[in-house]
Interface confidence: low
């Protein structure tokens, strides 16, 4: 007997037939290609079924014998046509063909659903040589079938550039239902109907669906897959799943939580990021969204001064990025700030109120009623003004800045004086005679220098002229005043 030759690395080599002059008379396999794992399958189908070759795809060889008799057509023998088995079971099936020994070069391959099974190490081909023909049995085994193994398998043999194809072997893997659509988690409005969908397939069919809510069956009668469950409405959170049943048993879908949308929880951790004289930048951490996305938020601001009228300013903003700059605030003022956010259900309660203060700013208006007159006896210019209204000082006055510009015969020079906060008058020395002096005054706080007043001009004559009358801030719309003395 010929010992079995193993070719581990090549699952699909060219299979040699017996060489002339060395024909074998016994029926031991001449060449056997290995089953990779050595696993003995749980389900086996016997190799060839005796009987006539089928007349499907046959090859009529062009070679004749010495007596010039034509050779019979080549064809695979009939074998089992349909195999039904359960998932995870093993299976082995085969095709066989007898090839006259004159053909010394044949290849055999397995195909599934029109695609060659490349590198399929669970294919094994055995040759049984005889005096005139060699029986070739190609076996294919799957150790643990899965649904993806379902399909139509065929053998193809190439011989002398002819192709011979076997009848198909249909593999049908049956198992527990397999979900193609499972219910999805949802957030729903209280007492509002919604649908859940469940779909599962076999084989075997049919697949029937039962719905389960909070561990209790919803429908007593099963529904054929696919199934849509209409829930008329919920008042509290529930967990739904579906059971898919077929002849092999049942599969349970994942449990999905159906949440009831509610108003959000109030924001937490409202904090001050930055303060200026007229704005406060706040941030907050959103509360639980109530299973519905935040739409927008409302910032409520009220003056913390007990003497204020208690009115609330409301600023609306988008829910993201949990940050808002509150503008148009008064300087050096205290405010209480709260944040509330809304989803489609409604507004949350207001967050805990926090206290915030604006900083000092530069005054927003200039000193009022600026008057300028010449005191010739002391060779000074006297300046008087009224301080800006308290509300518009935007801080505590620390003084004033006086700009005086002297212009004479094309020469111009600007001087700045700082004055303490107590006075509302100042005296500056005459710098140049026969010149125009232009005076502007600005109020100063720790927050900065405010705007300068409108310019007031006074003409300073040459020595010997008489002091006449003051110059003052013009009424709105008038030209700059010039007083010639």
């Amino acid at each position: 007997a010929i010992t079995e030759a193993r070719e581990e690395a090549k699952p699909y080599p060219l299979f040699p037939g017996p060489f002339p002059g060395s024909l074998q008379t016994d029926h031991t396999p001449l060449l056997s290609l290995p089953h990779a794992s050595g696993y003995q399958p749980a389900l086996m189908f016997s190799p060839t079924q005796p009987g006539r070759p089928h007349t499907g795809n046959v090859a009529i060889p062009q070679v004749t014998s010495v007596e010039s008799k034509p050779l019979p057509p080549l064809a695979f023998k009939h074998t089992v046509g349909h195999i039904i088995l359960s998932e995870h079971k093993g299976v082995k099936f085969n095709c066989s063909i007898s090839v006259p020994n004159i053909y010394q070069d044949t290849t055999i391959s397995w195909w599934k659903d029109g695609k060659e099974l490349l590198g399929a190490h669970h294919a094994i081909t055995q040759f049984y040589p005889d005096d005139e023909v060699t029986a070739i049995i190609a076996s294919f085994s799957i150790t643990s079938v899965q649904r993806s193994d379902n399909g139509s398998y065929i053998c193809k043999m190439k011989i002398n550039n002819e192709e011979i194809v076997s009848d198909p072997i249909y593999i049908e893997v049956q198992g527990l239902p397999h979900f193609t659509k499972q219910p999805e988690s949802m957030n729903v409005t209280r007492n509002t109907a919604f649908n859940l969908t469940c779909q599962a397939v076999g084989p075997p069919e049919p697949v029937n669906i039962f719905w389960v809510q909070n561990s209790s069956r919803v429908n007593e009668q099963p529904e054929k897959s696919p199934s849509v469950l209409t829930v008329p409405g919920l008042t509290e959170m529930a967990v739904f799943s579906c059971e898919a049943h077929n002849d092999k048993g049942l599969t349970v879908s994942k449990g999905v939580q159906i949440n009831i949308k509610a108003i959000p929880s109030p924001p937490t951790e409202v904090s001050i990021r930055n303060s200026t004289a007229h704005s406060i930048l706040i941030s907050w951490v959103p509360g639980f969204d109530g299973y519905s996305p935040f739409r927008n938020c409302s910032i409520q601001v009220k003056e913390a001064d007990p003497l204020s009228n208690g009115s609330v300013m409301i600023f609306n903003t988008s829910a993201l990025p949990h940050l808002y700059q509150i503008k148009q605030l008064q300087a050096l003022a205290n405010y209480s700030i709260g944040v509330s956010c809304m989803n489609e259900i409604g507004w949350s309660a207001v967050s805990p109120w926090i206290l915030a203060s604006t900083t000092e700013g530069a005054p927003s208006v200039a000193p009022l009623n600026v008057t300028v007159f010449l005191n010739e006896s002391s060779d000074n210019v006297d300046i008087r003004w009224m301080k800006p209204p308290t509300k518009q000082q935007d801080g505590e006055l620390v003084g004033y800045r006086i700009s005086h510009v002297w212009q004479s015969a094309g020469i111009s020079k600007e001087l700045l004086e700082e004055v303490g906060q107590n006075g509302s008058r100042a005296r500056i020395s005459v710098q140049v005679h026969n010149a125009t002096c232009t005076v502007r005054i600005a109020a100063v706080t720790r927050g900065g220098v405010g705007p300068f007043s409108d310019p007031v001009k006074i003409f300073i004559p040459a020595h010997g002229w008489v002091d006449y009358a003051p110059s003052s801030t013009p009424a709105p719309g008038n030209a700059d005043p010039v007083l010639i003395i």
Epitope: V239, G255, Q257, F288, D289, Y291, P321
Partner: antibody, heavy 120, light 107 residues
Framework: QVQLVQSGSELKKPGASVKVSCKAS????????MNWVRQAPGQGLEWMGW????????TYAQGFTGRFVFSLDTSVSTAYLQISSLKAEDTAVYYC?????????????WGQGTLVTVSS | DIQMTQSPSSLSASVGDRVTITCKAS??????VAWYQQKPGKAPKRLIY???NRHTGVPSRFSGSGSGTEFTLTISNLQPEDFATYYC?????????FGGGTKVEIK
Amino acid sequence: QVQLVQSGSELKKPGASVKVSCKASGYTFTNHGMNWVRQAPGQGLEWMGWINTYTGEPTYAQGFTGRFVFSLDTSVSTAYLQISSLKAEDTAVYYCARKGVTAARYFDYWGQGTLVTVSS
Amino acid sequence: DIQMTQSPSSLSASVGDRVTITCKASQNVRTAVAWYQQKPGKAPKRLIYLASNRHTGVPSRFSGSGSGTEFTLTISNLQPEDFATYYCLQHWNYPLTFGGGTKVEIK
């Protein structure tokens, strides 16, 4: 304030089991899912899965099924990680980490970690 | 699974430097990225969630940006206490996946 306090270090032999606890305080335990994260010595962070502290339903990452079990005792606000048939490669620091927001999956608070050493 | 590729794996920097760490996701993860800081022998600490939101108490020198597949953590004015390992996490899809980490060392 929110705190996750884990049980102390464990030295185990291969094949043994270990149960790591993570006790939560400072918030409503059933409002936030609990994640488990592994960090092997000198390595990065690896997400093992999480457990829904409301329903008790666990979700395991690939590679953490079979020998790893997440469980809860809501009466004492504690999550557990049990590892059976310990192997040397299970040597790591195991962290519990709280889900930040009901609807999101990031973590906002972490336990201090439990070192599990598997050695013969 | 979604892979998070973090770079660089380590970097040296000085106090006061601006440091940038990036994470690339193998799929679109929208803005579902968080950043964590871990010091030796300690548990990770939260920094940023949803790509750009600072957790409460995290200094403003830490900022996050990005969406889709590219994300950045920036430390604008590196302080001595910032030398640590930083991890990104995608939380768009299960399984959640971390980046490999970036170790920030003193130059």
